[in-house]
């Protein structure tokens, strides 16, 4: 079954409404905001999660603090348009008819325009670099232990196939996790690296998307790995198209 049967909840997505109205009285869960049915045995797409987050009552939503390190996803939260599979639509527009093109992780990759703006295809983000700084510890983590634990984390918690974790680099206190997934590599049923990175980002921020009030418990040989800052860089299969005006502003 696709959800925790006993109390009909979605283990992998707390931003859902679940009820035993599936086939044969099975537990079925729908994402808040979009009402789309979700598969609770795997991650929910980032697009549906953002939509659910924006639909939550304002007083229930955590305020997003603009970070001095927000180098890439500068636009922050928005209420996205998702396709029937839950992926981002290539063109996103706000209520004032300002439109822009996004990549597969929903990050803007063009200048903003009007309703005449065309986004011919959803460009895939095929390489994600997660740059972390951990809090001071008694000594450095053993690199091979750290590598193994982070790979296990992405495999077990985020259901990401190990072949998509390209590398784990470590120079105390900086950890870099490289995720790579070309269109040709991603098979049906594979978790998308963008979704895995988003779940990880929310876990690191203490805003876990998994069921319950608890958070991430990440340890390397028993020593807690606590992150004090995160930067995520996205590389697309086709380079973004920003005007020179934006680059010199």
């Amino acid at each position: 079954h696709t959800a925790a049967q006993d109390n009909c909840t979605c283990p992998t997505n707390k931003m859902t409404v679940c009820s035993p109205d599936g086939p044969g009285g099975r537990c079925q869960c729908r994402a808040l905001g979009s009402g789309m049915a979700v598969d609770c045995s795997t991650l929910t797409s980032k697009c549906l999660l953002l939509k659910a987050r924006m639909s939550a009552p304002k007083n229930a939503r955590t305020l997003v603090r603009p970070s001095e390190h927000a180098l890439v996803d500068n636009d922050g939260l928005y209420d996205p348009d998702c396709d029937p599979e839950g992926r981002f639509k290539a063109r996103q527009c706000n209520q004032t008819s300002v439109c822009w093109c996004v990549n597969s992780v929903g990050v803007r990759r063009t200048d903003k325009g009007d309703l005449s703006l065309r986004c011919d295809e959803l460009v895939r983000t095929h390489h994600i670099l997660i740059d972390l700084r951990h809090r001071p510890t008694a000594g450095a983590f053993n690199h091979s232990d750290l590598d193994a634990e982070l790979r296990r984390l992405f495999r077990e918690r985020y259901r990401l196939h190990p072949k998509f974790v390209a590398a784990v680099h470590y120079e105390q206190p900086t950890i870099q996790i490289e995720l790579r997934q070309n269109t040709s590599q991603k098979a049906a049923g594979d978790v998308d690296i963008g979704d895995a990175a988003y779940y990880f980002e929310r876990d690191i921020k203490g805003e876990s998307l998994f069921q319950g009030r608890g958070g991430l418990d990440l340890r390397v040989r028993g020593e807690p790995l606590q992150v004090e800052r995160t930067l995520i860089y996205y590389l697309d299969e086709i380079p973004p198209k920003f005007s020179m005006k934006r680059l010199t502003a």
């Epitope: 283990p11 077990e156 998994f210 069921q211 319950g212 608890g214 958070g215 991430l216 418990d217």
Partner: nanobody, 123 residues
Framework: QVQLLESGGGLVQPGGSLRLSCLAS????????MGWFRQPPGKEREFVAT????????YYADFVKGRFTISRDNSKNTLYLQMNSLRAEDTAVYYC????????????????WGKGTLVTVSS
């Protein structure tokens, strides 16, 4: 997906002891927080105790503190509940539960459940 199978329940006299076991199977059990819950006859299911995946942190309901001990053996994929000084009000079906991998020991994060084992405390 995690599968859980409880054992060790039975009839015991007041003041007696019992040890429950829960065998976990599935690809992720080594990194799941786990816990025990119980459902007394005619009542709601209630939290008993939880333990972190590394085993270093435990959390108990007030009514079992000092009497029950939760522990785990990750090499055997097994969770235990040692129950001492049992009382009639401890009579219940005891359920083993597990979290998603790498979740902490918060009881609200338990999403996978066993079928339960009945503990009856009676003279």
């Amino acid at each position: 997906q995690v599968q859980l199978l409880e054992s060790g329940g039975g009839l015991v006299q007041p003041g007696g002891s019992l040890r429950l076991s829960c065998l976990a199977s599935g690809r992720t059990v080594g990194r799941t927080a786990m816990g025990w819950f119980r459902q007394p006859p005619g009542k709601e299911r209630e939290f008993v105790a939880t333990i972190s995946w590394a085993g270093g942190t435990t959390y108990y309901a007030d009514f079992v503190k000092g009497r029950f001990t939760i522990s785990r053996d990750n090499s055997k994929n097994t969770l235990y509940l040692q129950m001492n000084s049992l009382r009639a009000e401890d009579t219940a079906v005891y359920y083993c539960a597990a979290s998603e991998p790498y979740s902490d020991y918060d009881p609200s994060g338990m999403v996978y459940w066993g079928k339960g084992t009945l503990v009856t405390v009676s003279s």
